[in-house]
């Protein structure tokens, strides 16, 4: 705390503001009749240095001049940038117990002269905005520095505004609050910034600009779109702009896209026709403006207009497949399946599907609409049938897709050869085949069909399928493929009026099964033992089971068990063995094997054959 200098004064030479690296002399003088006692020699003046209110040094040893008991001069050097406080105190040497008394204090500021301001940039936002300029001040001066922005222009006028930088605020931008209007488009303006502080001054180079150089139009507003005759592909984009705008840039994209469609429009006057939109698609539209064809700056992009284009009638054809099942000697059940159109084909919300089953010769027609992607009907087994399906939205229907209903696996000569299924990775399977050897009619296409081998999958789940051109002999299936699940895969070869198929099982990833089959019964028939079992529960199979193994050994024997390996067939749940001795008690069990290995053993059963077994 500095008292109001009642006891004396402190002065600084050359000044209280000095350049970095300079020294200063601080003189502390007592006022007349002030001091410790009537003996001036007992007055000792000391100088203390404070930085950020913390005492950092006693400058007792820096005295360069001393009028004993009356005044002292101290030299201070190596002052750091910023402000340093010096306090002069009076120490009465004959009374050591009393603390020194403050006399007076002074603040010395160390800094640098300002550098010439650089990179002046001026902007006016919109035709009715005001001119604001910013600049780079250069190095920090550590002193209060005043900046004057001067703008000179037509009519011999100069506009100026000031601000200052210190340790609390920075001044590198000023808004002059004056508007430049388009009638001054040809006029030249000159801007400069002057910086001044206690150690010097500097001025920027003059920067010349025109109205067009600095005015950034406001972004367009009130954006809307009008679809001509409710068209889904053609629309007129409309917006409001500032009066002087001559050039617009439009950008638009579907919401899930990553790249914009860009359009430049000259003299659009707030209107532009777009002709390449996708129906029933969420779009984002933005517009930017410019006041001059060659010069000037683009405005910021407008706020986005987000809207969905109207529907148009579906295009493209449905991908149809079917299943046939005989019910009795004169009736069959036809189940039709089809895949949903992708959005670019559906071009709207599909409301329903129109399904037709027609008997070609007798002209019998069954028609129906459904909202589902499958349809089942019972029809006579006689006659040649064809099916067609089309998709409808609010604007119309797609062209019907036709398919001939043939016996899919009825012609052995059309069955593809050497069908194989290899797991590619966790979620797909590569299926390959060779064409039928002796097909008497040309293969029009292959259909690869797959379904998880789980109970009830035929009735519960629709099949998955891929259409393959006749010259391709492989398919990578991935839709709904999960690891550790076995799929039945069929490859159909279809001609105009016939079908042949081959079947294989495959999985995308496998492990050894969790458990072995459960032996439910052992029966003796005609000198043979029949082992019956229940299959491993579906979740525990963990892939395609290649074969089962039946193990047996004499009870209490330590010898290796004998085994019989059976090719896995889903329909089979019993198997005969005939190498057991009569009236010997055996222990039997089963395991299951996938490509990854063998399961733990299933339950053990004991059995003692009675008859005369071979």
């Amino acid at each position: 705390n500095i008292d109001v200098c009642k006891l004396g004064t402190v002065t600084v030479q050359p000044a209280p503001v000095i350049p970095l690296g300079s020294a200063a002399n601080i003189s502390c003088s007592l006022n007349p009749k002030q001091g410790c006692s009537h003996y001036p020699s007992s007055n000792e003046l000391i100088l203390l240095k404070f930085v950020n209110d913390v005492l950092v040094e006693n400058l007792h040893g820096k005295k360069v001049h001393d009028h004993t008991g009356h005044s002292s001069t101290f030299q201070v050097t190596n002052l750091s940038l910023g402000m340093t406080l010096f306090v002069c105190k009076l120490n009465c040497s004959n009374s050591q117990k009393k603390p020194p008394v403050p006399v007076c204090g002074v603040e010395i500021s160390v800094g640098v002269a300002p550098e010439p301001p650089q990179n002046i940039s001026c902007v006016q936002e919109g035709e009715n905005g005001t001119v604001a300029c910013s600049w780079n001040s250069g190095k920090v001066t550590y002193l209060k520095t005043n900046y004057t922005l001067q703008l000179s222009g037509p009519n011999n006028l100069t506009c100026q505004k000031q601000c200052f930088s210190d340790n609390r605020q920075n001044c590198n931008r000023l808004d002059l609050g004056i508007n430049l209007s388009p009638d001054l488009a040809e006029s030249r303006f000159i801007v400069r910034v002057t910086a001044i502080n206690d150690l010097g001054n500097s001025s920027s180079l003059p920067h010349t600009f025109t109205f067009l150089d600095i005015v950034i139009p406001l972004p367009p507003w009130d954006i809307r779109i009008n679809f001509l005759n409710a068209s889904g592909s053609r629309g007129t984009l409309q917006w409001e702009d500032e009066g002087q705008v001559v050039l617009n840039q439009l950008r638009y994209q579907p919401l899930n896209s990553t790249s914009w469609n860009m359009v430049n429009a000259t003299n659009a006057k707030g209107k532009y026709d777009l002709r390449d939109l996708r129906p029933f698609t969420e779009y984002e539209f933005q517009i930017s403006s410019k006041l001059h064809l060659s010069g000037g700056s683009w405005s910021n992009w407008s706020e986005s207009l987000r809207t969905r284009t109207p529907e148009e009638e579906p295009v493209g054809i449905l991908d149809i497949w079917y299943m046939k099942q005989d019910i009795d000697y004169d009736r069959q059940q036809i189940s039709l399946f089809w895949k949903s159109l992708n959005p670019s084909e559906a071009r709207g919300k599909i409301l329903h599907y129109q399904v037709t089953l027609q008997e070609v010769t007798k002209k019998t027609t069954l028609q129906n609409t459904t909202r589902h992607t499958s349809w089942t009907r019972v029809i006579p087994r006689t006659g040649a049938w064809t099916a067609s399906v089309s998709a409808a939205n609010s604007k119309g229907a797609s062209a019907p897709t036709h398919i001939n209903i043939v016996d899919l696996c009825g012609t052995g000569l059309l069955a593809p050869h050497q069908v194989s299924a290899k797991s590619e990775n966790m979620d797909n399977i590569l299926v390959t085949w060779q064409p039928p050897k002796k097909a008497d009619s040309a293969v029009r296409e292959y259909i690869v069909e797959w379904r998880a081998l789980q109970p009830g999958s035929i009735t519960k789940f629709p099949p998955h399928w891929l259409r393959i051109p006749p010259d391709n002999m492989s398919a990578l299936i991935s839709e709904n493929i999960k690891p550790y699940i076995c799929y039945e895969i069929r490859v159909h070869a279809l001609s105009e009026s016939q079908g042949g198929c081959s079947s294989i099982r495959g999985d995308s990833k496998h492990k050894a099964p969790v458990s072995g089959p459960h032996i439910t019964a052992i029966t003796e028939k005609k000198e043979r033992l029949f082992i019956s079992w229940t299959h491993i529960p579906f979740p525990e199979q963990r892939g395609c089971i290649l074969h089962y193994r039946i193990y047996w050994k004499e009870r209490d024997s330590t010898a290796q068990p004998e085994l019989c390996e059976i090719q896995y067939r889903r329909s089979q749940n019993s198997h005969p063995i005939s190498s057991l001795q009569p009236r010997v008690t055996y222990v039997l069990w089963m395991t299951a094997v996938t490509a990854a290995g063998e399961s733990p053993q299933g339950n053990e059963r004991e059995f003692c054959p009675q008859g005369k077994a071979n």
């Epitope: 006028l157 505004k161 000031q162 808004d175 002059l176 609050g177 004056i178 508007n179 430049l180 209007s181």
Partner: nanobody, 123 residues
Amino acid sequence: QVQLQESGGGLVQAGGSLSLSCAASGSAFRLNFMGWYRQAPGKQRELVAAINSGGTEIYHDSVKGRFTISRDNADSTVWLQMNSLKPDDTAVYYCAADRGISWSKLAGGMDYWGKGTQVTVSS
């Protein structure tokens, strides 16, 4: 409506000083720009100096460094301190004001005007 009342004109010798004052009344709180124009006989009216409520000052190049404009935003008063006066500065000085300003409007298109006060500088 805005009324502008000037005062402080008069006769002064070359090299002397004068201070003009202008007080606005009415809807004066809306005035962003206030300033001084002058018109000498047979000449067009020209802006001498103007100031906005944000502190931006505008000077005609012929008076720069000699005249200083200042303002009290609170009571809508503007002053023009004229030093080192020259015979060429002889004119009727008008106080003017506007809600907002463009460079083009500075040429003489302000919305509100005072009646004027005569300044004569003798040689």
